[in-house]
């Protein structure tokens, strides 16, 4: 019969022959022959392979180095790599999460639009008219100006994006 030019899923072509790939968590020791099956061996502890493969070496698990602000989100297995994330108050500097930086704070005049996570930084937004923020914070949203009217008071000092309005008593007209 004609030697194959393509192989089925989970197989690979070698020496004009289709051999079985090694399953996730195992590496290739020797290719199959006309008489023998592919020989695979489990990955060692702290190693992994996450696909059907013909790799002769397993990959090492990622190390979530606490000195870089990292911690383990998901422990590595023979079939999956370790997933790292950042300690509370920090976020990853890249998608691979190889190191962490402190969450950004929103300056006075700006409020938090989206609180930071282990993988994304704080998103700030300027306080619109009618709102203010007088602190630098990674959590505080813009607060609405105090409504003097609902307290039976009048505005004595207008609010800004950094300060609240100042309310005061209404001037009574003398009879």
């Amino acid at each position: 019969p004609e030697p194959p030019t393509a192989c089925r899923e989970k197989q690979y072509l070698i020496n004009s022959q289709c051999c079985s790939l090694c399953q996730p968590g195992q590496k290739l020791v020797s290719d199959c022959t006309e008489f023998t099956e592919t020989e695979c061996l489990p990955c060692g502890e702290s190693e992994f392979l996450d696909t059907w493969n013909r790799e002769t070496h397993c990959h090492q698990h990622k190390y979530c180095d606490p000195n870089l602000g990292l911690r383990v989100q998901q422990k590595g297995t023979s079939e999956t790599d370790t997933i790292c994330t950042c300690e509370e108050g920090w976020h990853c500097t890249s998608e691979a999460c190889e190191s962490c930086v402190l969450h950004r704070s929103c300056s006075p005049g700006f409020g938090v639009k989206q609180i930071a996570t282990g993988v994304s930084d704080t998103i700030c937004e300027p306080c619109p008219v009618g709102f203010f923020s007088n602190v630098s914070s990674a959590f505080e949203k813009c607060h609405p100006w105090t409504s003097c009217e609902t307290k039976d008071l009048v505005v004595q000092q207008a609010g800004t994006n950094k300060t609240d309005v100042v309310c005061g008593p209404q001037d009574r007209l003398r009879a």
Epitope: S46, Q73, G76, T80
Partner: antibody, heavy 119, light 113 residues
Amino acid sequence: EVQLVESGGGLVKPGGSLRLSCAASGFTFSDYGMHWVRQAPGKGLEWVAYISSGNRIIYYADTVKGRFTISRDNAKNSLYLQMNSLRAEDTAVYYCARQDGYRYAMDYWGQGTLVTVSS
Amino acid sequence: DIVMTQSPDSLAVSLGEKVTINCKSSQSLLNSGNQKNYLTWHQQKPGQPPKLLIYWTSTRESGVPDRFSGSGSGTDFTLTISSLQAEDVAVYYCQNDYTYPLTFGGGTKVEIK
């Protein structure tokens, strides 16, 4: 037969130090990750530290971080736990346990060694 | 940290009766890559070290009698002893094997009524 034998426990004063050892036999020590787990008298289990088969990866519980150091010597089939700045709350039986590269679970435990921190 | 909550704290059951121990984790123990739940059960008999009983939620360790079974997924797990034997008197611990720090449930003491 897999065997893990802990030693080095004893009575120590608060602020003192102790070095625990775990002698492994009956398996290829350098192929396994290792853990220390402790158990205070009459209490449950508390994970302390982990070291990977090749020494590359080390993790600690927050309660011991900066005070305890896990290490291993694959040539001597031995695991160690250096314990400094000991506190009364570190009083416990300390177990070493191995982790294989398949289950990723602690599949064998030693008999434990008792550490007592008291003045 | 993942908090593991076991219930009940203790129970006394007659020989041959069924035992059910529950374990709840504060977050999912499902590994997104291989779809396995990394929940482990250990058995600790009086005066002995713990012994691995079940890993990946439901896979019995070699040599563990088939009266022991594990089930569950995500955050809710169960250990069942189908017919309690005298040698099953022990404290049973569930354990998060999904992430560091590894965390244990408070334990469930099983006694004979």
